[in-house]
């Protein structure tokens, strides 16, 4: 009985199409597959950013795979051929591994890259990114931002920079069609007469960096002698009501502070007949049903009632 062997895939490589972190892993079938013409060969692909503890593993019949990576670090990948047990009269046969690596050859000392990069998707409508210049760079240093997400033909450069002292320190993005719930890739590179500038790469999903507008139209309604219902409306914009969480801060007579987190646009408050003043503010955040993370809005304008006995009337702004 001769031992069945299979070769690893050929020409295994990582290809960078210029999408700022979205890379293609591709390969060719192994040599000498003639003996297994009736068989569907599979490939087990493992890949990771260098420094990551865990490998991502994919089993595929294709000759390519695409995924996103952190280009601030190197990438390593390995692949081998799998012959299913149906092809070998018994156990699965695996080839040896073919391995490859990819990294962007850096330039510039790390301190020259942008510092404190911060991106916020305001009200799920307007993306704004800001940064601080690298440490020790001169005023002649200018940074440029490029971005890509699936749906764009190629990476685009920012066309509306925020400037300070003649330097680009941020970008106001145009309307980004069909850009949420997918990886959004950014590269900020730079140039200087004085010294090379290190590029920085960032990846996030827009729905996870949304900062909504604050809620509006805050009102009070007396529900019973000891209950007041606080109400407000969702802010104008594209975010549906089902996507909001709210945090309320309530002050009674300048002493008691109540803080609560709710999912609806109402909150019922127990009060006493002695309550002379009631104030509350609300802020909003995209909830776990619509994103993995988010940023609290600013607090709403404060709504207060004071002067008359709260038990005697319905209170409206």
């Amino acid at each position: 009985d001769t031992e069945i062997k299979v070769n690893p895939p050929q020409d295994f490589e990582i290809v960078d199409p210029g999408y700022l972190g979205y890379l293609y892993l591709q390969w060719q079938p192994p040599l000498s597959l003639d003996h297994f013409k009736e068989c569907t060969v599979e490939y087990e692909l493992k890949y990771r950013n260098i420094g990551s503890e865990t490998w991502k593993t994919i089993i595929t019949k294709n000759l390519h795979y695409k995924d996103g990576f952190d280009l601030n670090k190197g990438i390593e990948a390995k692949i081998h051929t799998l012959l299913p047990w149906q092809c070998t009269n018994g156990s699965e046969v695996q080839s040896s591994w073919a391995e490859t690596t990819y990294w962007i050859s850096p330039q510039g000392i790390p301190e020259t890259k942008v510092q404190d990069m911060d991106c916020v998707y305001y009200n799920w409508q307007y993306l704004l990114c800001s940064w601080k210049p690298g440490i020790g760079v001169l005023l002649d240093t200018n940074y440029n931002l490029f971005y890509w997400y699936e749906g764009l033909d190629h990476a685009l450069q920012c066309v509306d920079y925020i400037k300070a002292d003649g330097q680009n320190i941020g970008c106001r993005f145009p309307y980004l069609e069909a850009s949420d719930y997918k990886d959004f890739y950014i590269c900020v590179n730079g140039s200087s007469e004085n010294k090379p500038i290190r590029s920085s790469y960032f990846t996030f999903q827009l729905q996870n960096i949304v900062k909504p507008l604050p809620p509006v139209y805050l009102t009070f309604t007396r529900e019973s002698s000891c209950e007041i219902k606080l109400k407000w409306s969702i802010p104008l914009g594209p975010i549906p009501a089902r996507c909001f969480d709210y945090e309320i801060e309530i002050r009674e007579d300048d002493t008691t502070l109540v803080t609560a987190t709710v999912e609806n646009e109402t909150y019922t408050l127990k009060t006493t007949n002695e309550t002379r003043q009631l104030c509350f503010v609300v802020r909003s955040k995209v909830n776990i049903y619509c994103s993995d993370d988010g940023i609290w809005s600013e607090w709403s304008d404060k709504q207060c009632w004071e002067g008359e006995d709260l038990s005697k009337k319905t209170l409206l702004r």
Epitope: G51, P106, Q107
Partner: antibody
Framework: EVQLVESGGGLVQPGGSLRLSCAAS????????VHWVRQAPGKGLEWVGV???????DYNSALMSRFTISKDNAKNSLYLQMNSLRAEDTAVYYC??????????WGQGTLVTVSS | QVVLTQSPAIMSASPGERVTMTCTAS???????LHWYHQKPGSSPKLWIY???NLASGVPARFSGSGSGTSYSLTISSMEAEDAATYYC?????????FGSGTKLELK
């Protein structure tokens, strides 16, 4: 196998010039940056500068005006041109490959002695 | 520039002894860019520990590194004769790149 071999060291008078070479094999200077680092006799290590894979250069500003780093990708070689040499430039000069923001392979070094 | 101060400057240890040397930076340095090199007399330096705690290829597991911010250390859990050398810390974060003045480790 990755190898870096420095050459061009020797005795030079104060005020003189010298050009050191670093021949790289087992990797390409178009893919990796290479640093020059020096070590005065019995002393510690001092960074001179780096030639990045893309061709740009970073220098130790204390030495920048007198030292120039260049490379020839076709020859896979790096060079350090040193002018207006002083006694305090006496040192072993090493070239070292840059890999993931560290220096992972070093040459054996070449000794430069500046003395009258 | 970032000044790296290594202590002690010279130390000796017996085989089997635990050894710790420190490196203090004058400014905060990212742990990603703090490395240690090992050098024996007449030889070129070798990368020993990279990014604070990762052992370079071929470095024995008795070596370890730790630290963050301005304070870093290299530890040998059990000294062996071949560990006698000078160890340099190095920061790759800020220009100019700098090295510590070295800790010379001798065999007692």
């Amino acid at each position: 196998e990755v190898q870096l071999v420095e050459s061009g060291g020797g005795l030079v008078q104060p005020g003189g010039s010298l050009r050191l070479s670093c021949a790289a094999s087992g990797f390409s200077l178009t893919k990796y940056g290479v640093h020059w680092v020096r070590q005065a006799p019995g002393k510690g290590l001092e960074w001179v500068g780096v030639k990045w894979a893309g061709g740009s250069t970073d220098y130790n500003s204390a030495l920048m005006s007198r030292f120039t780093i260049s490379k020839d990708n076709a020859k896979n070689s790096l060079y350090l041109q040193m002018n207006s040499l002083r006694a305090e430039d006496t040192a072993v000069y090493y070239c070292a490959r840059d890999h993931r923001d560290a220096m992972d392979y070093w040459g054996q070094g070449t000794l430069v002695t500046v003395s009258s | 520039q970032v000044v790296l101060t290594q202590s002690p400057a010279i130390m000796s240890a017996s085989p089997g002894e635990r050894v710790t040397m420190t490196c203090t930076a004058s400014l905060s340095v990212s742990s990603t860019y703090l490395h240690w090199y090992h050098q024996k007399p007449g030889s070129s330096p070798k990368l020993w520990i990279y990014s604070t705690s990762n052992l370079a290829s071929g470095v024995p597991a008795r070596f370890s590194g730790s630290g963050s911010g301005t304070s870093y250390s290299l530890t040998i859990s059990s000294m062996e004769a071949e560990d006698a050398a000078t160890y340099y810390c190095h920061q790759y974060h800020r220009s100019p790149l700098t090295f510590g003045s070295g800790t010379k480790l001798e065999l007692k």
